[in-house]
């Protein structure tokens, strides 16, 4: 299973949930789906409080049961540790896969905690973020704004992912914006 | 009682195909992960492929991924295992299990020209 | 593909105790609490002894016991008996290949 890894925004706007939590217990397989289940304790919800409505405690993220076909496996074994986790919610489940956005909290960037905590939000409904994996690459529409991490370095690492957020500057028109700015 | 039958099992040219089936009794069958399990002959136990209750979740192992499908039909309680471009290597006694907790007899997979 | 590593005879004499031991790693025996043991008589089925590391289905003897220790587990036959000469197998869940067997253990009941 490979996957390229989101910008921290597409993350946020692509999933139903996003919380801080912690890996408290020891996996578990059912053995009716065949689904990993990780006990967690959140710490904090950033987005998914209309999907959940009154079940806003998350107790359990599951993901499949092999590597091959995208199961997450969390090779953390320090159970104080915060992790951010974006998913999407399957009967009221968190589902995350190698695919998702799940990393520590401290090794994001200020301006990735501020993005999950309150900017990316602003970007979701008008604005995209669009991968540029070749050059040339060039802008589908006004909304989008080129993401160009992958070309110079991996893309979690990347000055756009770490810094900037697509946010509508005007009706029609997105641009990169630095979210150092806009930290408090 | 809990009873698992497997079918299916012969003789198939190299590059053939064959079907296997497995028939469920004695318990929920929707409930439960099922698996194969091969064994070829005076060797040990290879796990093969795993779907979930639903079907929704197929596992397979490296060696017969591409080739082999795994499907049920929880209407019929019934395991299914689809062999494509055999290998003599995959000659085996062929095994349906509950989550590896309940075993069947086994049906007997032969590849060879 | 390497399989978990099992010693590949071991014998007893009636009413000793004996013990097979499963070696794997910290992603299959040491990272979950999902093994099991398998008694195989020859042409016959695999039947389940212990799963979970150390749970016994209804219906096996409490002469059989299942414990684990880091990468280690380990099958132990009390007051050994002449209808336990059987090949055993331990079986674990691993998040690479999903579950993986030893290479089997064939038990000799001595005299």
């Known amino acids: 299973c490979t996957c390229v890894p989101p910008h921290p925004q597409t993350a946020f706007c692509n999933s139903d949930l996003v919380i801080r939590a912690k890996f408290v217990g020891t996996p578990e397989v059912n053995q009716t789906t065949l689904y990993q289940r990780y006990e967690i304790k959140m710490t904090k919800m950033y987005k998914g409080f209309q999907a959940l409505g009154d079940a806003a405690d998350i107790r359990f993220v599951y993901t499949p049961a092999m590597e091959s076909v995208c199961g997450y496996f969390h090779r953390s074994h320090n159970r104080s540790e915060e992790f951010l986790i974006a998913g999407k919610l399957q009967d009221g489940l968190l589902h995350i896969t190698t695919c998702s956005f799940v990393a520590p909290w401290n090794s994001l960037s200020l301006a990735q905690r501020r993005g999950f905590t309150k900017t990316y939000t602003v970007g979701c409904e008008e604005c995209t973020v669009f991968p540029c994996l070749s050059i040339p690459c060039k802008l589908q529409s006004g909304t989008h704004c080129l993401w160009t991490d992958q070309l110079l370095q991996g893309s979690e690492k990347g000055f756009q992912s770490r810094h900037l957020a697509c946010l509508p500057r005007e009706p029609g028109l997105c641009t990169w914006q630095s979210l150092r700015s806009q930290i408090a | 009682q809990v009873q698992l039958v497997e079918s299916g099992g012969g003789l198939v040219q190299p590059g053939g195909s064959l079907r296997l089936s497995c028939a469920a009794s004695?318990?929920?069958?929707?409930?439960?992960?099922m698996s194969w399990v091969r064994q070829a002959p005076g060797k040990g136990l290879e796990w093969v492929s795993a779907?979930?209750?639903?079907?929704?979740?197929?596992y397979y192992a490296d060696s017969v991924k591409g080739r082999f499908t795994i499907s049920r039909d929880n209407s019929k309680n019934t395991l299914y295992l689809q062999m494509n471009s055999l290998r003599a290597e995959d000659t085996a006694v062929y095994y349906c299990?509950?989550?590896?907790?309940?075993w069947g007899q086994g049906t007997l997979v032969t590849v060879s020209s | 593909d390497i399989a978990l590593t099992q010693p590949a005879s071991v014998s007893g004499s009636p009413g000793q105790s004996i013990t097979i031991s499963c070696t794997g790693t910290?992603?299959?025996?040491?990272?979950?609490?999902?093994v099991s043991w398998y008694q195989q008589h020859p042409g016959k089925a695999p039947k389940l002894m212990i799963y979970?590391?150390?749970n016994r289905p209804s219906g096996v003897s409490n002469r059989f016991s299942g414990s684990k220790s880091g990468n280690t587990a380990s099958l132990t036959i009390s007051g050994l008996q002449a209808e336990d000469e059987a090949d055993y197998y331990c079986?674990?869940?691993?998040?690479?290949?999903?579950?993986?067997f030893g290479g089997g253990t064939k038990l000799t009941v001595l005299g």
């Open positions: 299990a509950r989550f590896l907790d309940i």
């Open positions: 004695g318990f929920t069958f929707s409930s439960y992960a």
């Open positions: 779907i979930s209750g639903s079907g929704g979740s197929t």
């Open positions: 910290s992603s299959d025996v040491g990272g979950y609490n999902y």
């Open positions: 979970d590391v150390s």
């Open positions: 079986q674990s869940y691993d998040f690479r290949r999903f579950s993986v």
